[in-house]
Structure formats: C-alpha cells, structure tokens
C-alpha cells in the first residue's frame, strides 16, 4: 500500500499558486506524484509522475473555488488522493508593496507600488484585482517603540513637520477594507531628515 502525500497545502502569494506536500516514508523506493485540478466535473493533470513535492497551479482563475488533489505513486501502485479546496482571490497572501522614499528637509515623500500579480507577464497588480485596495503606512522614530499608522488616500504620501536630523523608519502594506484583509509589511526603509527649512532649488 502506497502512503499518501503528507502536509498538503497551498502556498499562494500574489496569485502565484504553488501546491506543496511532503513525501511520506516509503521503504520500497522513490515515490512520484501526480497533482490534478477539477475543471468542470473532470480532473485534469497538472503535474504528472513528478519527483518534485510541489506543483504550480498559477494558471487557475483567480475567482471561484478550485478543488485540487495529489497522490503518491510507485510502479503500478498509488495512494489515495489528498484533496484541498482553494479560492485564490480569498486565500492568496498579499505580498509587500514596493516603496520609494525621498527626504526633503523635514519631510519624507513616499510613493507606493502595488505588488505585481506574480504569474502574469504584463503589468497587472494586486490593486487591479481588488477594488477596495488601499495602503496602510506605519512609521516611527528609529530606536523607539512608538509607531504611528496612517491610511493614504493615494499611491503617495508625505510625512511633514518631522524632527530635523532624525532618522525615521517607514513600512507599507496593502489592505482590503471590504475583506478586512491585510497584506505583508514591506521591509522598513529608514531615512534621516535634514533641517526644517525648505531646501533652495
């Protein structure tokens, strides 16, 4: 009897949908795996007889529920299928946005870039898919614990009247108010303000 794949889960970030599993202990030899998806009442092969423990399902529609399954195989034997259901638009993790930060005197000027949909060749972003897309920004004085949060209305924001010659750290994440769903925070960007007068151009 061939044991089934273990710890089957979907790892989906920005609609890059990778079904992952672990190979069970099996004394007779090396197992292969077949992963399928349900497409209008019929299961279709996605990865056949692979020795890998993952399979890319990024071509699935972002909308609606999908049933995926994977089994282990050895020679003419195979395990039972292990099924999972997955709805990309609900379940995918929203990766960290990009952020550009520029210091102008006692202000930090920030521009945000929504994460790209991973499996596409064009410039579609997560902001295209989610109508309610907005950003959360948090910032703090470097070396302190107190953090301040703001929700910019646009793809840019300016933090004004900051303390001069002080290092501030900023990070941003995507947020979906209608789903109450937050994305991953970007890595902090830390910049030092200069004096509190406008720099002459």
């Amino acid at each position: 009897m061939v044991p089934p794949p273990e710890n089957v889960r979907m790892n989906s970030v920005n609609f890059k949908n990778i079904l992952q599993w672990e190979s069970p202990a099996f004394a007779k030899g090396n197992l292969t795996f077949t992963a399928q998806y349900l497409s209008y009442r019929i299961f279709q092969d996605k990865c056949m007889n692979t020795t890998l423990t993952e399979c890319d399902f990024s071509s699935l529609s972002k909308y609606g529920d999908h049933t995926l399954r994977v089994r282990a195989e050895f020679a003419d034997e195979h395990s039972d299928w292990v099924n999972i259901t997955f709805c990309p638009v609900d379940d995918t993790i929203i990766g960290p946005p990009g952020m550009q930060v520029e210091v102008l005197a006692d202000s930090l000027h920030m521009r945000f870039l929504a994460p790209k949909i991973e499996n596409e060749y064009e410039t579609w972003t997560m902001k295209n898919v989610y109508n309610s897309w907005t950003y959360n920004v948090q910032y703090w004085k470097n070396g302190t614990d107190e953090k301040f949060q703001i929700t910019p209305q646009y793809d840019f924001e300016v933090l004004r009247n900051l303390e001069p010659w002080t290092t501030y750290c900023v990070q941003v994440r995507g947020f979906l108010p209608d789903r109450n769903k937050a994305g991953e925070w970007s890595e902090p960007v830390c910049e030092q303000t200069t004096h509190d007068e406008t720099v002459p151009s």
């Epitope: 999908h66 295209n128 898919v129």
Partner: nanobody, 126 residues
Framework: QVQLQESGGGSVQAGGSLRLSCAAS????????MGWFRQAPGKEREAVAA???????SYADSVKGRFTISKDNAKNTLYLQMNSLKPEDTAMYYC????????????????????WGQGTQVTVSS
C-alpha cells in the same frame, strides 16, 4: 460585477456561417484573457478558441481554419466567426473571461476562466 452576454446563435445548414458576439459589462476586454467554449448534450464543456490580452489566439484542432476569434476593445465585445459549419459543431456556446491575465500561455481549461455567460445555442443541420 462582471457580466457577459452572448448573442448570434441560431440554426444553420451544414456549410453555413454564423458570427457569435459576447458583450461585457463591468470588465474591459483589453485587460484579460477571453475564450469561447461549447457543450453538446451529454458531453463535457470544451474549449473552442481563446484570445489573450496581447491578441494572441489559439484554436481547438477541430475548428482550425474554420473559426476565427477576435475582439473589439472599443466596443468591449468578443466575436467568434464560424464558417463551414458541420453538424458536429452543434452545441451551446459560452463566452468566458479571466480579468487581469496576460499572454504568457494560452488558457484552455474551464478552471482557468472566472466569469461565464449564459450561452447561445448553435444548431447545424445536414
């Protein structure tokens, strides 16, 4: 909310032609992948033709050289020109859309499209 509405189906003699249309609301055709599928009674739904946002097209072997898929982004309408129709083309024809997808690879499976029309019937008699 994305809505797709097919039209242009009907009855035709073998060797005749039809042009199916699919009008979209709540969605811009230039931003995604589109496809035509069909389903004959007692059979599974199958892909007929697909077009990506970059305009690249692909066809089922059974319709190559006879059917042409196209889209008019200005009118937000998808078309399927069907020539030299055969009785085996008789089916319900469905328009499908997947917003914000690109021309990286042809989408050829029901599960790869998120939005569907209600279908339009095509009947070809011999």
């Amino acid at each position: 909310q994305v809505q797709l509405q097919e039209s242009g189906g009907g009855s035709v003699q073998a060797g005749g032609s039809l042009r199916l249309s699919c009008a979209a609301s709540g969605y811009t055709y230039s931003s995604g992948c589109m496809g035509w599928f069909r389903q004959a009674p007692g059979k599974e739904r199958e892909a007929v033709a697909a077009i990506n946002s970059d305009g690249s097209t692909s066809y089922a072997d059974s319709v190559k050289g006879r059917f042409t898929i196209s889209k008019d982004n200005a009118k937000n309408t998808l078309y399927l020109q069907m020539n030299s129709l055969k009785p085996e083309d008789t089916a319900m024809y469905y328009c499908a859309a997947e917003p914000y997808c690109s021309g990286g690879y042809p989408r050829w499976s029901v599960a790869e499209f998120g939005y569907w029309g209600q279908g339009t019937q095509v009947t070809v008699s011999s």
